[in-house]
Interface confidence: medium
């Protein structure tokens, strides 16, 4: 059955810069990916990027670069400076809309004991919502 994994990493070179990687483990075709922070998209979270396989990518500060890594995974780099920069305990969520199954969402944050540049391997995170 479909699953979503989320990996959050702090960059060693820029301690206030984060990379979020998300992936979808399922057989459906991905229609849309939404990355948010502060909670699930639409439930208190703020959208950082929207990635559409054909229509392209939209991103909002402090997102610096959102891109497709594979047909079923994406990455997002966040700027670390400014009032809106993320902190170590910020929660990031990824929502994959997979046709026709629906929306599958998981959230993750920086592992509490992680050193800069290190992170846990991308294991499936708890799915908060599979509408």
């Amino acid at each position: 059955t479909p699953e979503v994994w989320v990996q959050v990493r702090m960059e060693a070179t820029e301690l206030s810069s984060f990379t979020i990687r998300c992936g979808f483990l399922g057989s459906g075709s991905i229609s849309l990916v939404t990355v948010s922070w502060g909670g699930p998209n639409g439930a208190g979270g703020t959208t950082l990027a929207v990635l559409h396989p054909e229509r392209g990518i939209r991103q909002w500060a402090p997102a610096r670069q959102a891109r497709w890594e594979t047909q079923s995974s994406i990455s997002l780099i966040l700027e670390g400076s400014g009032a809106s920069s993320p902190c170590a305990n910020t929660t990031f969520c990824c929502k994959f809309a997979s046709f026709p199954e629906g929306s599958w969402e998981a959230c993750g944050s920086l592992p509490p004991s992680s050193d800069p540049g290190l992170s846990a391997p991308p294991t499936p995170a708890p799915i908060l919502r599979a509408d």
């Epitope: 479909p2 075709s29 229609s31 639409g42 199954e101 629906g102 929306s103 919502r129 599979a130």
Partner: antibody
Framework: EVQLVQSGAEVKKPGASVKVSCKAS????????IYWVRQAPGQGLEWMGT????????SYNQKFRGRVTMTRDTSTSTVYMELSSLRSEDTAVYYC???????????????WGQGTLVTVSS | QIVLTQSPATLSLSPGERATLSCSAG?????MHWFQQKPGQAPRLLIY???NLASGVPARFSGSGSGTDYTLTISSLEPEDFAVYYC?????????FGQGTKLEIK
């Protein structure tokens, strides 16, 4: 107000085809998928398939593969479900529904058409 | 395909009583959705993603479960709750519904 209005009841002979329409209003048509469910008299619900109104992708229940075709017309915000090679066991009420899955924001609510009775009889 | 088995087929209770409806999946699913249907009407979504209340659904309805076993609970039955209830899985194609549980007035 969100509405899904389906075409009227149909009586068909075995072997014929039927095309049921589902006209959407009150929301942005391409923001939501539409799926079709049928219900034979006194029986339960059966998912027939789903259409992505934006991309025109379809996913059908294997049981109906080859007999069912779902299409959409964005200019009229209408989805069509055509079922061919009808047999008596296809007699049922056919419902279209706006898929509650792809929601931009919560809360989640579903909307259904009123249903279309298709009777297959010789 | 994943077969969903609902039990009991018919549940006879009185208003004010607690109703517990079960849905068992032939193999594990991530989430379950629940619909209510009254005679001559289209189904109505009650619970999505196992435990989330759809818009406008009273708080007396709740859902729980995981894996292969899911439950819909109505804490205190109101007269308008007597209807047929269906569970649905969307974890695997084709999407399937249970055969339904008829909740009738005792």
């Amino acid at each position: 107000e969100v509405q899904l209005v389906q075409s009227g009841a149909e009586v068909k002979k075995p072997g014929a085809s039927v095309k049921v329409s589902c006209k959407a209003s009150g929301y942005t048509f391409t923001d939501y998928w539409i799926y079709w469910v049928r219900q034979a008299p006194g029986q339960g619900l059966e998912w027939m398939g789903t259409i992505d109104t934006s991309e025109h992708k379809t996913s059908y229940n294997q049981k109906f593969r080859g007999r069912v075709t779902m299409t959409r017309d964005t200019s009229t915000s209408t989805v069509y479900m055509e079922l061919s090679s009808l047999r008596s066991e296809d007699t049922a009420v056919y419902y279209c529904a706006r898929d509650f899955i792809i929601t931009v924001n919560y809360p989640v609510v579903d909307y259904w058409g009123q249903g279309t009775l298709v009777t297959v009889s010789s | 395909q994943i077969v969903l088995t609902q039990s009991p087929a018919t549940l006879s209770l009185s208003p004010g009583e607690r109703a517990t409806l079960s849905c068992s999946a032939g193999s594990s699913v991530n989430y379950m959705h629940w619909f209510q249907q009254k005679p001559g009407q289209a189904p109505r979504l009650l619970i999505y993603s196992t435990s989330n209340l759809a818009s406008g659904v009273p708080a007396r309805f709740s859902g729980s479960g995981s894996g292969t076993d899911y439950t819909l609970t109505i804490s205190s039955l109101e007269p308008e709750d007597f209807a047929v209830y269906y569970c649905q899985q969307r974890s695997s194609l084709p999407f399937t519904f249970g055969q339904g549980t008829k909740l009738e007035i005792k």
